[in-house]
């Protein structure tokens, strides 16, 4: 019924300079993508390739060990969160290529863009759980010897996933498709209609629960851990610090643009120039956040090479050593052998 070529629009239009002469058609619908969108497409493509392959490999390596190895449980869940988010990328990629036209329907609009938010919350909650685990290993080694088991780890992961789903619901509910009259285009986005306060509330909750609060707690948590481990001669290592900083910092660095633009847009009028500028950068911010979905496997490999000192080791074997090594629960050594586990703090969100 609607036989439009969305990739190469060809529509006459009234001059947007608000001239009084509406008799002159102006074809200003550009066939070329904006620079931020092109950058977003490049990032999406790289993230998809690395994220799908890397996380699939991590899932494969950790799945066999997840029944008995707690670290494997953490990494398995993080990889699943990332892998799920990467599956939405071809759809988002296609939409940007078609000038943000969304031909996939209302259900896909609600579900697919929400995956990256689910990933954000799942990852940060899993990171919080992993951080708590690392903290307990250092400060409560006896408790860990008695109670730290695979069953409890799975329960903690289930709670993290449940909370993540709960926190994703508002964005899921407010996602709608809007079909524009001219040029003909179906857009997928959030619509709060008149309720600007609700929009702000969602943005603030996302910023606090998905960014600021985790930033604060992880910073405090790892400050204590590092202070304790540095006080022991055997574990004093700049490499440990670098890994911890890389893992935690990357999560917050890649989420920062999305969170900042999101909060700003919720306080701006949709017709304001700043809002329109930020809206043009939206895809780029999302793609930047999506880097979180592929960076964990990269960190694991880099760290694995560093700690194993075997650059020629096969990738699955290298990952297995990094991801499934069980922490030794002796206070003086608790951080030494499980340093790489802290990479689980690196999480992805949107």
């Amino acid at each position: 019924m609607n036989s439009f070529n969305y990739t190469t629009p060809d529509y006459g239009h009234y001059d947007d300079k608000d001239t009084l002469d509406l008799n002159t058609p102006v074809d200003k619908t550009s066939n070329t993508l904006r620079v931020p969108d092109i950058l977003a497409l490049v990032i999406f493509a790289v993230v998809f390739l690395v994220g799908v392959l890397g996380n699939a490999l991590v899932v494969w390596v950790t799945a066999f060990e997840a029944k008995r190895t707690i670290n494997a449980i953490w990494f398995l869940n993080l990889a699943v969160a990332d892998f799920l988010s990467c599956l939405a990328l071809p759809i988002l990629f296609t939409s940007i290529v078609q000038h943000h036209h969304w031909p996939f329907g209302g259900a896909a609009c609600s579900i697919l863009p929400s995956l990256i938010l689910l990933n954000m919350y799942a990852s940060i909650l899993l990171l919080a759980t992993i951080s708590a685990d690392r903290f307990l290993l250092v400060f409560k080694p006896i408790w860990c010897q008695n109670f730290r088991g695979a069953g409890l780890a799975w329960i903690a992961c289930a709670v993290a996933w449940g909370l993540a789903l709960l926190l994703t619901i508002p964005s899921f509910l407010y996602r709608v498709v809007r079909e524009e009259y001219f040029p003909p285009k179906v857009l997928c986005g959030v619509d709060y209609s008149h309720d600007k306060r609700r929009e702000r509330a969602v943005a603030i909750v996302r910023l606090v629960l998905g960014f600021l609060w985790p930033l604060l707690t992880l910073t405090i948590c790892y400050t204590f851990i590092l202070l304790r481990t540095w006080s022991r001669r055997a574990t004093r290592s700049t490499k440990t610090l670098k890994v911890v900083v890389a893992v935690v910092a990357s999560f917050f660095i890649f989420w920062l643009p999305y969170q900042v633009t999101g909060i700003m847009m919720s306080f701006l009028e949709p017709s304001s120039p700043t809002f329109l500028l930020l809206n043009k950068l939206d895809s780029l911010c999302v793609s930047f956040a999506y880097i979180n979905c592929c960076i964990n496997p990269i960190i694991y490999v880099v760290a694995g090479q560093g700690f194993q000192g075997r650059l020629r080791k096969s990738l699955p074997s290298l990952l297995r050593n990094v991801l499934t090594e069980e922490s030794v629960v002796r206070e003086s050594k608790s951080f030494t052998r499980s340093t790489v586990d802290t990479m689980a703090q690196k999480t992805q969100a949107v």
């Epitope: 036989s3 529509y11 006459g12 509406l22 058609p25 074809d27 524009e180 009259y181 001219f182 003909p184």
Partner: antibody
Framework: QVQLQQSGPELVKPGESVKMSCKAS????????MDWVKQSHGKSLEWIGY????????KYSQKFKDKAALTVDKSSTTAYMELHSLTFEDSAVYYC?????????WGQGTLVTVSA | DIVMTQTPLSLPVSLGDQASISCRSS???????????LHWYLQKPGQSPKLLIY???NRFSGVPDRFSGSGSGTDFTLRISRVAAEDLGVYFC?????????FGAGTELELK
């Protein structure tokens, strides 16, 4: 100047079909949508849909998708609307109007009366 | 569909008075381009509607400057600074941001 000249009034029986025309002049016919609007007696305006002569794109309001069929003849710069299976509720004035933005130019309207 | 709610439905005025018609949409009318496609039409008895104001506040060619439009997002207003005899008729607001294009129920401007 832009002109939209519509065909004359129609008196039809329930269940029949009617086809009305809208001859456009004074602008490049293929550059703009041709929209159609219904106005029942003493009531507001209802958008039926548009036809885009440039690429044959057509869009109907959900309410009219089984009632109206929009076509154009580019060679004569004329737009057509056919209404099917007419009922008494279809009695109204039907306007063609140049679209793609605000409806800046309208035809004079075609009165359709459905009567047994 | 976007519902356009016009108030009042009838507006009795005296010639020379100022008149104000309100139009509220059920959703934001801001287009992805940043434009707001809210327009005002006047229909006199036995005539086709005529475009007065397009994109919230722009007067169409030939429309006197006593007509002005304002608003943003979901709330819009048409003002006539000094009502003249030729201004009497039914005023419709309309949005062409989203499909389907929708119109308000109309406001009849009549003499007291």
């Amino acid at each position: 100047q832009v002109q939209l000249q519509q065909s004359g009034p129609e008196l039809v029986k329930p269940g029949e079909s009617v086809k009305m025309s809208c001859k456009a002049s004074g602008y490049t016919f293929t550059d703009y949508y041709m929209d159609w609007v219904k106005q029942s007696h003493g009531k507001s305006l209802e958008w039926i849909g548009y036809f885009y002569p440039n690429n044959g794109g057509v869009k109907y309001s959900q309410k009219f998708k089984d009632k109206a069929a929009l076509t154009v003849d580019k060679s004569s710069t004329t737009a057509y609307m056919e209404l099917h299976s007419l009922t008494f509720e279809d009695s109204a004035v039907y306007y063609c109007t140049r679209g793609s933005g605000p409806f800046a130019y309208w035809g004079q309207g075609t009165l359709v009366t459905v009567s047994a | 569909d976007i519902v356009m709610t016009q108030t009042p439905l009838s507006l009795p005025v005296s010639l020379g008075d100022q008149a104000s018609i309100s139009c509220r949409s059920s959703q934001s009318l801001v287009h992805s381009s940043g434009n707001t496609y809210l327009h005002w039409y006047l229909q006199k008895p036995g005539q086709s509607p005529k475009l007065l104001i397009y994109k919230v506040s722009n007067r169409f060619s030939g429309v006197p400057d006593r007509f002005s439009g304002s608003g943003s997002g979901t709330d819009f207003t048409l003002r006539i600074s000094r009502v003249a005899a030729e201004d009497l008729g039914v005023y419709f607001c309309s949005q062409s941001t989203l499909v389907p294009v929708t119109f308000g129920a109309g406001t009849e401007l009549e003499l007291k």
